[in-house]
C-alpha cells in the first residue's frame, strides 16, 4: 500500500478548516502531536487533532447525517403532506356540495319541509365531516337520526298539513313509528350501507396519509447513536487529522457505515412497502359505494326517493299512525297495527350517471403511482445518502477510515477497526424506541387497510336484494344503484366541477424542484393537474 503523504508540518490547513466549524477556538495543535487521548481518530503517527476537536467532529457528523436524512425525505414528505391537505379539503368540498344539493332538493320539491329539513341535513353532514376527520360517531346513528327527525316533519307538513301546533307532542311517537313501521322502506338501510362503507374508506385513507407524514417526520428527526457518530466521524473527518483535506471516503466503506448507522431505520422498509401496497389496494377499491364522492353527491336523490316512497304509502300510513300515536304518551305502537300489505312496493333504483372529467379517484391513483416510486425509500436510504455525500468514485485513492487506499476492501476495513468497535455489533442492536413505535403504527394501519380492502365484483350487501330491492336497470352490480333522478331534481352534470374551487394553502413555491406552479385560478381544475408536477 502507498506510504501516507507527509503530514502538514504546521497543522495550518487543519486549523483553517476547523476554524470554519468552530470559529475562535484554539483546539487545533500548532504542530502535529502524538494524540494519545484520541478515541475515534486513532493515529498511526503524529496527528493534528485533539480530543476536543474529535468531539466537535462527532457533533458535526451527526448533524450532517440528520440534514442528509431530511433532504433525502424532503420530496416524499412534501408529496404526502400536500396530498393529505388537498384530499382533506376536497372531501370537505364534497360534503358541502352534497349538503347544498340536498338542501336544494328540499327547497325545490318539498318547500313546506324547510327550514327544518335544512337543520336535519346540516346536522347530518356536520357529523359526516366530523366522522371523516376521526370523530367517534356511529354512521348508522347519523342516518337513523336523519330519518327519525325527517319523518315527524313529513307527517305533520306533507301528510297532515292541517295538524294544529298542539299536536306537536306526537313527535316522539312518530320518531319511534318511523323505525317500527319502516315508513321509508329500505332506503335508510341502503343509505347506511353506502354512507358507512364510503366514509369508512375515506376516513382510513386520510388516516393512512397522516400516518405516512408521521413516519417520515419520525425518521427525519432521528437522533443517531454515539457509535454511529464515531463511525461517521471516522469516515468524514479523521482524514483531516492527517492533513488529508481533499480525500473522499471510499464508496463501499460509506455503504457499510450507513448500513450500520441506519440498521434500525431500514427495519421500517418491510412495513413501509406493505403500507404503500395496501394503500394502493384501498385506492383501487374506492369506487361506487366505496367512493364518498359518488355516494354523498347522489344522496339527495336517494333521500328524494325515500320521501316519495312515504308519499306513495301516505294513505295507509296515516291510518296506522293515527291509531298508534293517538295517545302519544303511551307509545303503544305494535305490529298489531301494522297491515301486512303495507310497504311491499319494490323500489327500482336508477343510476345517476355522471360524466367524469378530473376526479378525486384519478387524483388518488396519481398519488399512488408517485408513492410507489418511493416504495424502496427506506431500504435505499443508505445508498441514497452515500450518493449525496462526498465519496470517491470507483473507490480509487479513497479514505477507508484509517488511511488512504487505492482500492476499498471491506474485510481489511473490518479487520482494521476490530480494536475500535465492532460494526456488526452495531447493526445487531434493535431499532430505537421511536422506530419501534412507528413500526407498530404502520403494522396497525396496514392491518386496517387490509381489512378495508374491498371485495371485487358484487360489493353491495346481498341482503339488500332480499329486503325489497331489485337490480332493475341498475346494471349488473347493485352497487351502481346510488339513486334515481326524480322530477325537479338537480342534474349532477359533472360531479367534479367543484374541484376548481379547491385551494390549498401550502406554499407551493417552496416545493423542491418546482418553480412554475400554477395557481388554482389558472385553469378550472389546475389544482389537481398541477399537483402531478410536484415531486
Amino acid at each position: 500500500q502507498p506510504p501516507p503523504p507527509p503530514p502538514d508540518a504546521t497543522c495550518h490547513q487543519v486549523r483553517s478548516f476547523f476554524q470554519r466549524l468552530q470559529p475562535g477556538l484554539k483546539w487545533v495543535p500548532e504542530t502535529p502531536v502524538p494524540g494519545s487521548d484520541l478515541q475515534v481518530c486513532l493515529p498511526k503517527g503524529p496527528t493534528c487533532c485533539s480530543r476536543k476537536m474529535e468531539e466537535k467532529y462527532q457533533l458535526t457528523a451527526r448533524l450532517n447525517m440528520e440534514q442528509l436524512l431530511q433532504s433525502a425525505s424532503m420530496e416524499l414528505k412534501f408529496l404526502i403532506i400536500q396530498n393529505a391537505a388537498v384530499f382533506q379539503e376536497a372531501f370537505e368540498i364534497v360534503v358541502r356540495h352534497a349538503k347544498n344539493y340536498t338542501n336544494a332538493m328540499f327547497k325545490n320539491n318539498y318547500p313546506s319541509l324547510t327550514p327544518q329539513a335544512f337543520e336535519f341535513v346540516g346536522e347530518f353532514f356536520t357529523d359526516v365531516s366530523l366522522y371523516i376527520l376521526g370523530s367517534d360517531i356511529n354512521v348508522d346513528d347519523m342516518v337513523n337520526e336523519l330519518f327519525d327527525s325527517l319523518f315527524p316533519v313529513i307527517y305533520t307538513q306533507l301528510m297532515n298539513p292541517g295538524l294544529p301546533d298542539s299536536a306537536l307532542d306526537i313527535n316522539e311517537c312518530l320518531r319511534g313509528a318511523r323505525r317500527d313501521l319502516k315508513v321509508f322502506g329500505n332506503f335508510p338501510k341502503l343509505i347506511m350501507t353506502q354512507v358507512s362503507k364510503s366514509l369508512q374508506v375515506t376516513r382510513i385513507f386520510l388516516q393512512a396519509l397522516n400516518l405516512g407524514i408521521e413516519v417520515i417526520n419520525t425518521t427525519d428527526h432521528l437522533k443517531f447513536s454515539k457509535d454511529c457518530g464515531r463511525m461517521l466521524t471516522r469516515m468524514w473527518y479523521c482524514s483531516y487529522c492527517q492533513g488529508l483535506m481533499m480525500v473522499k471516503p471510499c464508496g463501499g466503506y460509506c455503504n457499510v457505515v450507513m448500513q450500520g448507522c441506519m440498521a434500525g431505520v431500514v427495519e421500517i422498509d418491510k412495513y413501509w412497502r406493505e403500507y404503500i401496497l395496501s394503500l394502493e389496494e384501498l385506492v383501487n377499491g374506492m369506487y361506487r359505494i366505496y367512493d364518498m364522492e359518488n355516494v354523498l353527491l347522489g344522496l339527495f336523490s336517494t333521500i328524494h326517493d325515500s320521501i316519495q316512497y312515504v308519499q306513495k304509502n301516505a294513505g295507509k300510513l296515516t291510518t296506522t299512525i293515527g291509531k298508534l300515536c293517538a295517545h302519544s304518551q303511551q307509545r303503544q305502537y305494535r305490529s298489531a297495527y301494522y297491515p301486512e300489505d303495507l310497504f311491499i312496493d319494490k323500489k327500482v333504483l336508477k343510476v345517476a350517471h355522471v360524466e367524469h372529467e378530473e376526479t378525486l379517484s384519478s387524483r388518488r391513483r396519481e398519488l399512488i403511482q408517485k408513492l410507489k416510486s418511493f416504495i424502496s425509500f427506506y431500504s435505499a436510504l443508505p445508498g441514497y445518502i452515500c450518493s449525496h455525500s462526498p465519496v470517491a468514485e470507483n473507490d480509487t485513492l479513497c479514505w477507508n477510515g484509517q488511511e488512504l487506499v487505492e482500492r476499498y476492501s471491506q474485510k481489511a476495513a473490518r479487520n482494521g477497526m476490530k480494536n475500535q468497535f465492532n460494526l456488526h455489533e452495531l447493526k445487531m442492536k434493535g431499532p430505537e424506541p421511536v422506530v419501534s413505535q412507528i413500526i407498530d403504527k404502520l403494522k396497525h394501519i396496514n392491518q386496517l387497510l387490509r381489512t378495508m380492502s374491498m371485495p371485487k365484483g358484487r360489493v353491495l350487501d346481498k341482503n339488500l336484494d332480499e329486503e325489497g330491492f331489485e337490480s332493475g336497470d341498475c346494471g349488473d352490480d347493485e352497487d351502481e344503484c346510488i339513486g334515481g333522478s326524480g322530477d325537479g331534481m338537480i342534474k349532477v352534470k359533472n360531479q367534479l366541477r367543484f374541484l376548481a374551487e379547491l385551494a390549498y394553502d401550502l406554499d407551493v413555491d417552496d416545493a423542491p424542484g418546482n418553480s412554475q406552479q400554477a395557481t388554482p385560478k389558472d385553469n378550472e381544475i389546475s389544482t389537481f393537474h398541477n399537483l402531478g408536477n410536484v415531486h
Epitope: 391537505a85 382533506q88 379539503e89 370537505e92 368540498i93 358541502r96 338542501n103 324547510t114 327550514p115 327544518q116 335544512f118 337543520e119 341535513v121 346540516g122 346536522e123 356536520t126 365531516s129 366530523l130 376527520l133 337520526e145 327519525d148 327527525s149 315527524p152 301546533d165 306537536l168 313527535n171 374551487e501 390549498y504 394553502d505
Partner: antibody, heavy 119, light 107 residues
C-alpha cells in the same frame, strides 16, 4: 317582525345559579336550531351551547359542560339557559341566537343580557 | 378546535375609504365562514355567510372572499355607520369559533 327578546340576567355570587330566557316571535320557533353565545367585557364572542329544533341534539362548550343546561319549550316559543356553579369567568353578556342551517350562520340575535358573577 | 386570527386588530380609516379585513384559520374551513358586525352595546349582525354571500338587507359595499384558510371582508367605501367591530366565525369543525375581532375606527 322576527325578533328574540332576552331576560333573566343579573348579579350572582360565585357558585350560585341563574336562569336566562329568550322569547321568540315573528318566525316558527319550533323549526330552528337555537344557541347561546357570550361575550366577556371587552372581549370577543364565544359560543356556549346549542339545541336543535326537536331537542335531539344538544351541545356545550367545554368551558360550561356539566354546569350549564340548555332547553327549549316550542309551545311557548322560548329558549332557556340554566347556569349553575357559576364562576367569575362566566361574567359576560349572554346572547341567544338563531342558527340558520342553509346559511350556516347565526342570523338572528337577541339584545343580550348581562350576567355578573362576583362576591 | 379551529383558531381564527383576525388582522389587523384595529383599522383607522376615514369615511369613503376602502377597508380590508383579514381572517386566517388554523386549518382549512372550506367556505364555512361568516362575518358579523357589532356596534357598542348592540348584538352582532350577520353580514356575510358561506364566505362570500351577503345576508338579507346588507348593502352591496360589503363583500367577502376566500376559501380554505384565508378570508377577506372588504368594505368598498366606508360609511359613518360602518365604524364598528367585525368578527369572523367558522362552522367547518365543531365547535363554532369566532375570531378576536377587528375594530374599524374613524381616523
Amino acid at each position: 317582525q322576527v325578533q328574540l327578546v332576552q331576560s333573566g340576567g343579573g348579579l350572582v355570587q360565585p357558585g350560585g345559579s341563574l336562569r336566562l330566557s329568550c322569547a321568540a316571535s315573528g318566525f316558527t320557533f319550533s323549526h330552528y336550531t337555537m344557541n347561546w353565545v357570550r361575550q366577556a367585557p371587552g372581549k370577543g364572542l364565544e359560543w356556549v351551547s346549542y339545541i336543535n329544533s326537536g331537542r335531539s341534539t344538544i351541545k356545550y362548550a367545554d368551558s360550561v359542560k356539566g354546569r350549564f343546561t340548555i332547553s327549549r319549550d316550542n309551545a311557548k316559543k322560548s329558549l332557556y339557559l340554566q347556569m349553575n356553579s357559576l364562576r367569575d369567568e362566566d361574567t359576560a353578556v349572554y346572547f341567544c341566537a338563531r342558527w340558520e342551517w342553509e346559511q350556516e350562520a347565526f342570523d338572528i340575535w337577541g339584545q343580550g343580557t348581562m350576567v355578573t358573577v362576583s362576591s | 378546535e379551529i383558531v381564527l386570527t383576525q388582522s389587523p386588530a384595529t383599522l383607522s380609516l376615514s369615511p369613503g375609504e376602502r377597508a380590508t379585513l383579514s381572517c386566517r384559520a388554523s386549518q382549512s374551513v372550506s367556505s364555512y365562514l361568516a362575518w358579523y358586525q357589532q356596534k357598542p352595546g348592540q348584538a352582532p349582525r350577520l353580514l356575510i355567510y358561506d364566505a362570500s354571500n351577503r345576508a338579507t338587507g346588507i348593502p352591496a359595499r360589503f363583500s367577502g372572499s376566500g376559501s380554505g384558510t384565508d378570508f377577506t371582508l372588504t368594505i368598498s367605501s366606508l360609511e359613518p355607520e360602518d365604524f364598528a367591530v367585525y368578527y369572523c366565525q367558522q362552522r367547518s369543525n365543531w365547535p363554532p369559533t369566532f375570531g378576536q375581532g377587528t375594530k374599524v375606527e374613524i381616523k
